[in-house]
Protein backbone atom coordinates (compact mmCIF):
# COMPACT_ATOMS: atom_id res chain seq x y z
CA UNK A 1 0.00 0.00 0.00
CA UNK A 2 1.09 3.59 -1.07
CA UNK A 3 2.16 6.06 1.91
CA UNK A 4 3.25 9.62 1.76
CA UNK A 5 6.90 10.77 2.68
CA UNK A 6 8.14 14.36 2.61
CA UNK A 7 11.45 15.35 3.04
CA UNK A 8 13.10 19.36 2.45
CA UNK A 9 13.87 20.09 -1.31
CA UNK A 10 17.24 21.09 -0.32
CA UNK A 11 20.02 20.88 2.65
CA UNK A 12 23.37 22.23 2.89
CA UNK A 13 26.32 20.12 4.38
CA UNK A 14 28.47 21.64 6.63
CA UNK A 15 31.98 22.26 6.49
CA UNK A 16 32.66 18.68 8.30
CA UNK A 17 30.86 16.89 5.48
CA UNK A 18 27.77 16.29 7.86
CA UNK A 19 23.59 16.40 6.31
CA UNK A 20 20.90 16.41 8.07
CA UNK A 21 17.50 16.70 7.50
CA UNK A 22 13.71 15.25 8.93
CA UNK A 23 12.17 12.75 6.70
CA UNK A 24 8.39 12.49 8.11
CA UNK A 25 5.96 9.94 6.80
CA UNK A 26 1.88 9.58 6.68
CA UNK A 27 0.37 8.68 10.50
CA UNK A 28 2.38 5.41 11.52
CA UNK A 29 -1.30 3.96 12.76
CA UNK A 30 -0.48 0.70 14.56
CA UNK A 31 3.06 0.34 13.00
CA UNK A 32 4.82 -1.37 15.44
CA UNK A 33 8.07 -1.74 13.49
CA UNK A 34 9.23 1.05 10.77
CA UNK A 35 12.19 0.61 8.54
CA UNK A 36 14.01 3.68 7.23
CA UNK A 37 15.89 3.41 3.89
CA UNK A 38 18.36 6.54 2.93
CA UNK A 39 18.88 5.82 -1.19
CA UNK A 40 21.18 8.15 -3.20
CA UNK A 41 20.02 8.71 -6.78
CA UNK A 42 22.70 9.64 -9.35
CA UNK A 43 21.48 10.02 -13.03
CA UNK A 44 19.15 6.52 -13.18
CA UNK A 45 20.93 4.70 -10.64
CA UNK A 46 20.03 4.47 -6.99
CA UNK A 47 22.27 3.07 -4.39
CA UNK A 48 21.06 2.24 -1.00
CA UNK A 49 23.58 4.88 1.79
CA UNK A 50 22.09 3.40 5.08
CA UNK A 51 19.03 1.79 6.66
CA UNK A 52 18.01 0.83 9.91
CA UNK A 53 14.47 -0.60 11.75
CA UNK A 54 13.25 1.09 14.41
CA UNK A 55 10.25 0.00 16.86
CA UNK A 56 7.62 1.75 19.12
CA UNK A 57 9.53 0.91 21.64
CA UNK A 58 13.10 1.39 20.87
CA UNK A 59 15.31 4.49 19.31
CA UNK A 60 16.16 4.19 15.63
CA UNK A 61 19.53 1.94 15.59
CA UNK A 62 21.74 2.44 12.21
CA UNK A 63 24.54 -0.19 12.43
CA UNK A 64 27.73 0.69 14.18
CA UNK A 65 29.94 1.18 11.01
CA UNK A 66 26.89 3.04 8.97
CA UNK A 67 27.33 6.20 7.49
CA UNK A 68 24.18 7.70 8.93
CA UNK A 69 22.84 8.30 12.46
CA UNK A 70 19.15 9.25 13.29
CA UNK A 71 16.19 9.43 15.95
CA UNK A 72 12.94 8.56 15.42
CA UNK A 73 9.63 10.51 17.05
CA UNK A 74 6.12 9.28 16.30
CA UNK A 75 6.20 10.05 12.37
CA UNK A 76 9.33 12.02 11.91
CA UNK A 77 13.04 10.58 11.75
CA UNK A 78 15.49 12.99 11.66
CA UNK A 79 18.66 11.38 9.78
CA UNK A 80 22.18 12.56 9.45
CA UNK A 81 24.12 11.37 6.63
CA UNK A 82 28.58 11.65 7.88
CA UNK A 83 31.45 11.70 5.95
CA UNK A 84 30.14 13.71 3.08
CA UNK A 85 32.48 14.72 0.22
CA UNK A 86 32.01 16.71 -3.08
CA UNK A 87 31.39 13.88 -4.62
CA UNK A 88 28.95 13.11 -2.38
CA UNK A 89 26.86 15.89 -3.70
CA UNK A 90 23.24 14.28 -5.19
CA UNK A 91 19.56 13.37 -4.19
CA UNK A 92 19.09 12.04 -1.33
CA UNK A 93 16.10 9.84 -0.90
CA UNK A 94 14.22 8.83 2.51
CA UNK A 95 12.04 5.40 1.92
CA UNK A 96 9.73 4.59 4.54
CA UNK A 97 8.26 1.41 5.31
CA UNK A 98 5.73 0.03 7.29
CA UNK A 99 6.74 -3.26 8.73
CA UNK A 100 4.71 -5.03 11.07
CA UNK A 101 1.80 -5.85 11.96
CA UNK A 102 -0.02 -6.03 8.66
CA UNK A 103 -0.72 -4.32 6.44
CA UNK A 104 1.96 -3.01 4.72
CA UNK A 105 2.85 0.38 3.76
CA UNK A 106 5.70 2.20 1.66
CA UNK A 107 6.40 5.64 0.91
CA UNK A 108 9.01 7.64 -0.73
CA UNK A 109 10.08 11.00 -0.59
CA UNK A 110 10.52 13.21 -3.41
CA UNK A 111 14.41 13.61 -2.39
CA UNK A 112 16.62 15.82 -0.62
CA UNK A 113 19.35 17.30 -2.77
CA UNK A 114 22.59 17.64 -0.38
CA UNK A 115 25.16 20.21 -1.81
CA UNK A 116 28.60 19.43 -0.22
CA UNK A 117 31.31 21.74 -0.70
CA UNK A 118 34.63 20.74 0.35
CA UNK A 119 36.40 23.24 2.50
CA UNK A 120 39.61 25.07 0.94
CA UNK A 121 42.86 23.86 2.17
CA UNK A 122 43.78 26.03 5.19
CA UNK A 123 47.16 28.53 3.81
CA UNK A 124 50.42 27.91 4.82
CA UNK A 125 50.87 30.44 7.50
CA UNK A 126 54.53 32.20 7.58
CA UNK B 1 1.48 3.82 34.77
CA UNK B 2 0.14 1.81 31.47
CA UNK B 3 -3.13 0.15 32.43
CA UNK B 4 -6.11 -2.13 30.65
CA UNK B 5 -8.99 -2.49 32.99
CA UNK B 6 -11.52 -4.43 32.03
CA UNK B 7 -15.37 -4.80 32.62
CA UNK B 8 -18.50 -6.26 31.77
CA UNK B 9 -18.32 -10.06 32.56
CA UNK B 10 -21.63 -11.61 33.53
CA UNK B 11 -23.70 -14.57 33.56
CA UNK B 12 -25.97 -14.56 30.57
CA UNK B 13 -28.48 -17.32 29.44
CA UNK B 14 -27.59 -19.21 26.04
CA UNK B 15 -28.62 -17.08 22.87
CA UNK B 16 -27.91 -13.48 24.67
CA UNK B 17 -25.74 -11.23 24.33
CA UNK B 18 -22.97 -9.38 26.06
CA UNK B 19 -20.67 -6.30 25.89
CA UNK B 20 -17.31 -6.25 27.32
CA UNK B 21 -15.62 -3.32 27.73
CA UNK B 22 -11.34 -2.60 27.85
CA UNK B 23 -10.53 0.62 29.01
CA UNK B 24 -6.86 2.13 28.48
CA UNK B 25 -4.99 4.51 29.90
CA UNK B 26 -1.04 6.20 30.11
CA UNK B 27 -0.34 6.25 26.69
CA UNK B 28 -1.80 7.17 23.55
CA UNK B 29 -4.20 4.63 22.71
CA UNK B 30 -4.75 5.01 18.46
CA UNK B 31 -1.20 4.11 18.53
CA UNK B 32 -1.35 -0.07 19.26
CA UNK B 33 -3.01 -2.36 18.01
CA UNK B 34 -5.73 -4.06 20.86
CA UNK B 35 -6.10 -7.88 20.58
CA UNK B 36 -8.51 -10.32 22.12
CA UNK B 37 -7.49 -13.67 23.98
CA UNK B 38 -10.15 -16.13 25.31
CA UNK B 39 -9.38 -18.38 27.52
CA UNK B 40 -12.40 -21.13 28.45
CA UNK B 41 -11.84 -22.78 31.88
CA UNK B 42 -8.95 -24.90 32.05
CA UNK B 43 -7.71 -24.20 29.00
CA UNK B 44 -5.14 -22.75 27.09
CA UNK B 45 -5.10 -19.22 25.30
CA UNK B 46 -7.03 -18.73 22.45
CA UNK B 47 -6.36 -15.60 19.69
CA UNK B 48 -9.46 -14.33 19.02
CA UNK B 49 -7.94 -11.37 16.78
CA UNK B 50 -7.05 -7.73 16.78
CA UNK B 51 -8.51 -4.50 15.76
CA UNK B 52 -6.13 -1.29 14.40
CA UNK B 53 -7.15 1.42 16.80
CA UNK B 54 -6.28 4.02 14.40
CA UNK B 55 -7.73 3.17 11.28
CA UNK B 56 -10.94 1.13 13.21
CA UNK B 57 -9.94 -1.95 11.34
CA UNK B 58 -11.12 -5.33 12.79
CA UNK B 59 -8.93 -9.01 12.24
CA UNK B 60 -10.96 -11.82 13.31
CA UNK B 61 -9.60 -15.75 13.32
CA UNK B 62 -11.91 -18.02 11.68
CA UNK B 63 -13.61 -19.45 14.84
CA UNK B 64 -14.65 -15.74 15.91
CA UNK B 65 -16.18 -14.61 12.49
CA UNK B 66 -19.90 -13.72 12.74
CA UNK B 67 -21.13 -13.48 16.48
CA UNK B 68 -18.03 -11.63 17.70
CA UNK B 69 -17.52 -7.85 16.90
CA UNK B 70 -14.54 -5.53 17.72
CA UNK B 71 -15.24 -1.82 18.26
CA UNK B 72 -13.49 1.19 19.88
CA UNK B 73 -14.14 4.62 21.46
CA UNK B 74 -11.52 6.18 20.72
CA UNK B 75 -12.47 9.42 22.58
CA UNK B 76 -12.60 7.27 25.71
CA UNK B 77 -9.76 5.07 24.89
CA UNK B 78 -12.20 1.84 25.02
CA UNK B 79 -12.33 -1.25 23.22
CA UNK B 80 -15.16 -2.84 22.94
CA UNK B 81 -16.08 -7.06 22.41
CA UNK B 82 -19.47 -7.51 21.18
CA UNK B 83 -21.07 -11.15 21.50
CA UNK B 84 -23.99 -12.58 20.40
CA UNK B 85 -26.14 -15.53 19.86
CA UNK B 86 -24.08 -17.09 23.58
CA UNK B 87 -23.44 -20.85 23.71
CA UNK B 88 -22.49 -22.57 26.78
CA UNK B 89 -18.62 -23.19 25.03
CA UNK B 90 -17.95 -19.60 25.00
CA UNK B 91 -17.54 -19.82 28.64
CA UNK B 92 -14.08 -18.25 29.42
CA UNK B 93 -12.11 -15.47 30.64
CA UNK B 94 -11.92 -13.12 27.70
CA UNK B 95 -8.80 -10.96 28.41
CA UNK B 96 -7.59 -7.70 26.14
CA UNK B 97 -3.86 -7.30 25.16
CA UNK B 98 -1.57 -4.09 23.76
CA UNK B 99 -0.24 -5.70 20.98
CA UNK B 100 3.22 -3.94 19.40
CA UNK B 101 5.67 -6.77 18.04
CA UNK B 102 4.90 -8.52 21.14
CA UNK B 103 2.07 -8.02 24.65
CA UNK B 104 3.50 -6.29 27.23
CA UNK B 105 0.47 -4.88 28.54
CA UNK B 106 -2.99 -7.41 29.48
CA UNK B 107 -6.07 -6.43 31.77
CA UNK B 108 -6.78 -8.43 33.78
CA UNK B 109 -9.42 -10.26 32.48
CA UNK B 110 -13.44 -10.71 32.63
CA UNK B 111 -15.62 -13.81 32.85
CA UNK B 112 -18.54 -14.71 30.87
CA UNK B 113 -20.83 -17.78 31.80
CA UNK B 114 -23.24 -19.06 29.73
CA UNK B 115 -25.57 -21.31 31.32
CA UNK B 116 -29.24 -21.46 31.92
CA UNK C 1 -3.45 -21.34 9.91
CA UNK C 2 -0.09 -22.43 11.91
CA UNK C 3 -0.48 -24.82 14.18
CA UNK C 4 2.08 -24.44 17.11
CA UNK C 5 2.60 -27.92 19.15
CA UNK C 6 4.27 -27.69 22.60
CA UNK C 7 6.25 -30.10 24.34
CA UNK C 8 5.71 -31.56 26.71
CA UNK C 9 2.45 -31.14 28.20
CA UNK C 10 3.85 -30.92 31.55
CA UNK C 11 7.00 -30.89 33.56
CA UNK C 12 8.08 -31.00 36.89
CA UNK C 13 11.80 -29.65 37.84
CA UNK C 14 13.41 -29.62 40.97
CA UNK C 15 14.89 -25.99 42.05
CA UNK C 16 18.07 -25.11 40.89
CA UNK C 17 17.85 -27.67 38.07
CA UNK C 18 17.46 -26.95 34.40
CA UNK C 19 13.77 -26.69 32.19
CA UNK C 20 13.10 -27.06 28.51
CA UNK C 21 9.74 -26.11 26.96
CA UNK C 22 9.90 -27.32 22.55
CA UNK C 23 7.17 -25.38 20.82
CA UNK C 24 6.74 -26.57 16.86
CA UNK C 25 5.32 -24.39 13.88
CA UNK C 26 3.32 -26.19 11.17
CA UNK C 27 5.39 -24.27 8.59
CA UNK C 28 7.56 -21.35 8.91
CA UNK C 29 6.90 -18.27 10.90
CA UNK C 30 9.59 -15.96 9.37
CA UNK C 31 7.82 -13.17 8.25
CA UNK C 32 7.87 -10.93 4.83
CA UNK C 33 10.41 -8.75 6.40
CA UNK C 34 13.03 -11.32 7.51
CA UNK C 35 11.57 -11.01 11.47
CA UNK C 36 10.69 -14.28 13.78
CA UNK C 37 7.89 -13.13 16.04
CA UNK C 38 7.79 -15.83 18.15
CA UNK C 39 6.93 -15.28 21.88
CA UNK C 40 7.06 -17.11 25.30
CA UNK C 41 4.49 -15.95 28.25
CA UNK C 42 4.11 -17.25 31.69
CA UNK C 43 0.62 -17.28 33.16
CA UNK C 44 -0.09 -18.34 36.94
CA UNK C 45 -2.92 -19.49 38.21
CA UNK C 46 -5.82 -16.33 38.22
CA UNK C 47 -3.60 -14.02 36.53
CA UNK C 48 -2.84 -12.24 32.86
CA UNK C 49 -0.07 -14.04 30.66
CA UNK C 50 3.38 -12.25 31.15
CA UNK C 51 5.92 -11.73 28.58
CA UNK C 52 9.18 -13.84 28.84
CA UNK C 53 11.12 -13.73 25.16
CA UNK C 54 9.93 -11.88 22.26
CA UNK C 55 11.36 -12.15 18.89
CA UNK C 56 12.52 -15.47 19.37
CA UNK C 57 15.23 -14.97 21.72
CA UNK C 58 15.17 -11.28 23.12
CA UNK C 59 14.25 -11.42 27.28
CA UNK C 60 11.60 -8.77 27.65
CA UNK C 61 12.68 -5.51 30.30
CA UNK C 62 12.59 -7.40 33.89
CA UNK C 63 13.17 -11.13 32.82
CA UNK C 64 15.79 -12.89 34.47
CA UNK C 65 18.52 -13.99 32.71
CA UNK C 66 17.92 -17.32 33.55
CA UNK C 67 15.61 -17.12 30.87
CA UNK C 68 16.61 -17.75 27.19
CA UNK C 69 15.15 -18.52 24.17
CA UNK C 70 16.70 -19.72 20.84
CA UNK C 71 15.49 -21.62 17.26
CA UNK C 72 14.70 -20.39 13.79
CA UNK C 73 12.16 -21.72 10.99
CA UNK C 74 9.70 -23.91 12.93
CA UNK C 75 11.38 -24.79 16.15
CA UNK C 76 12.19 -23.22 19.02
CA UNK C 77 12.91 -23.71 22.65
CA UNK C 78 12.40 -21.99 25.90
CA UNK C 79 15.13 -22.54 28.57
CA UNK C 80 15.30 -21.88 32.06
CA UNK C 81 18.64 -22.84 33.71
CA UNK C 82 18.04 -22.79 37.07
CA UNK C 83 14.25 -23.35 37.86
CA UNK C 84 13.29 -21.20 40.83
CA UNK C 85 9.65 -21.39 42.96
CA UNK C 86 8.21 -18.74 40.95
CA UNK C 87 8.80 -20.16 37.89
CA UNK C 88 5.81 -22.55 38.54
CA UNK C 89 2.90 -21.88 35.97
CA UNK C 90 1.94 -22.32 32.32
CA UNK C 91 4.22 -21.41 29.30
CA UNK C 92 2.83 -20.40 26.20
CA UNK C 93 4.39 -20.26 22.70
CA UNK C 94 2.62 -17.43 20.49
CA UNK C 95 3.37 -16.94 16.74
CA UNK C 96 2.72 -13.38 15.61
CA UNK C 97 3.82 -13.97 11.52
CA UNK C 98 1.26 -15.21 10.13
CA UNK C 99 -2.83 -14.17 11.06
CA UNK C 100 -4.22 -15.72 12.16
CA UNK C 101 -2.00 -15.26 15.34
CA UNK C 102 -1.63 -18.67 17.39
CA UNK C 103 -0.69 -19.64 20.85
CA UNK C 104 0.82 -23.00 21.45
CA UNK C 105 -1.29 -25.15 23.90
CA UNK C 106 0.69 -24.46 26.93
CA UNK C 107 2.80 -26.48 29.27
CA UNK C 108 2.79 -26.87 32.97
CA UNK C 109 5.72 -26.37 34.90
CA UNK C 110 5.74 -27.30 38.53
CA UNK C 111 8.19 -27.42 41.10
CA UNK C 112 9.24 -30.96 42.77
Known amino acids: KGMHAAQPAVVLASSRGVASFVCEYGSSGNAAEVRVTMLRQAGSQMTEVCAATYTVEDELAFLDDSTCTGTSSGNKVNLTIQGLRAMGTGLYICKVELMYPPPYYVGMGNGTQIYVIDPEPCPDSD | EIQLVQSGGDLVKPGGSLRLSCKAS????????MNWVRQAPGKGLQWMGW????????TYADDFKGRFTFSLDNAKNTLYLQMNSLRAEDTAVYFC?????????WGQGTTLTVSS | DVLMTQTPLSLSVSPGEPASISCRSS???????????LEWYLQKPGQSPKLLIY???NRFSGVPDRFSGSGSGTDFTLRISRVEADDAGVYYC?????????FGGGTKLELK
Open chain 2, 97 to 105: ARRSIYYPY
Open chain 2, 26 to 33: GYTFTNYG
Open chain 2, 51 to 58: INTYTGEP
Open chain 3, 27 to 37: QSIVYSNGNTY
Open chain 3, 55 to 57: KVS
Open chain 3, 94 to 102: FQGSHVPWT
